[in-house]
Amino acid sequence: TPEVWVQVRMEATELSSFTIRCGFLGSGSISLVTVSWGGPNGAGGTTLAVLHPERGIRQWAPARQARWETQSSISLILEGSGASSPCANTTFCCKFASFPEGSWEACGSLPPSSDPGLSA
């Protein structure tokens, strides 16, 4: 069964800046990755970025830089300033659409006890 992993890290240099990393463990052709916060995209979450392997990347504030790390993993850096910036207990979700298996998603947040710079 395919799985999705999510890591959330707070940047040591900017305490309200986050890096989200997500990966897909499974076969099939990844068609789309959707990153959201505040819950899954289909359950009240707000889309931060959509990454397509051929047609490019779309991102919305406070997302600063979304990119493919490998063919099956992505990373997203969020801006640390402004009213829409995330807080320490924000939930981030990644949904991988793989053809023809379907969609698989997982969510993660910064562990309450983690220091800046540590991976979730």
């Epitope: 995209n41 359950a43 379907g102 969609s103």
Partner: antibody, heavy 120, light 107 residues
């Protein structure tokens, strides 16, 4: 304008074979996953086969597995369905459809359909 | 596989009426739900994707809603051309499955 045009349907005896074709135009065929969906007379819709944009991943339900083979030729903008060991219950209109990644794999374009009748 | 159950199978209505069609999934399908319209002798036509997004050229009287397992398609004021069969579909997990359809007929 996106166009999908099916051909190859007809009357065939039980146990016989048919090869359906779908000619695509008006879009970059190699960038889209494709499927065959059938509809028996007066019935609902059933996915009978799907293929990823590069042709590397395919799907078949148990009802046709081992009898039907989906393939594509991206250089010719064509989708195919080889149907062997046909049964009376395979009688249906067969539609070629395109999946849109950005729409959660919804099928945003359909051909007009080609009728396959399996009868002795 | 995920089973999509539509209700009711048939609805008899008059032009101008508001109608709500129901679709229930046997397990959560996130927001990967689409709705299609099919008229006799024609191929299905995409109306709604991702639960609530209207496809290009679809009139505003069509709207979709729901989450998890319960979804609805609403037509705010039926027009003569809206009498057709409507199918919901989940594209969350393979195999993509369709509901059995709801037929809207003129009363």
């Amino acid at each position: 304008e996106v166009q999908l045009v099916e051909s190859g349907g007809g009357l065939v005896k039980p146990g016989g074979s048919l090869r359906l074709s779908c000619a695509a135009s008006g879009f970059t065929f190699s960038s889209y996953h494709m499927s065959w969906v059938r509809q028996a007379p007066g019935k609902g819709l059933e996915l009978v086969s799907a293929i990823s944009r590069d042709g590397d991943s395919t799907y078949y339900p148990d009802t046709v597995k081992g009898r039907f083979t989906i393939s594509r030729d991206n250089a010719k903008n064509s989708l195919y369905l080889q149907m062997n060991s046909l049964r009376a219950e395979d009688t249906a209109v067969y539609y070629c459809s395109r999946h849109e990644d950005y729409f959660g794999f919804a099928m945003d374009s359909w051909g007009q359909g080609t009728l396959v009748t399996v009868s002795s | 596989e995920i089973v999509m159950t539509q209700s009711p199978p048939t609805l008899s209505l008059s032009p101008g009426e508001r109608v709500t069609l129901s679709c229930k999934a046997s397990q959560s399908v996130s927001n990967d739900v689409a709705w299609y319209q099919q008229k006799p002798g024609q191929a299905p036509r995409l109306l709604i994707y991702y639960v609530s997004n209207r496809f290009t050229g679809i009139p505003a009287r069509f709207s979709g809603s729901g989450s998890g397992t319960d979804f609805t398609l609403t037509i705010s004021s039926l027009q003569p051309e809206d009498f057709a069969v409507y199918f919901c579909q989940q594209a969350y997990r393979s195999p993509w499955t369709f509901g059995q359809g709801t037929k809207l007929e003129i009363k």
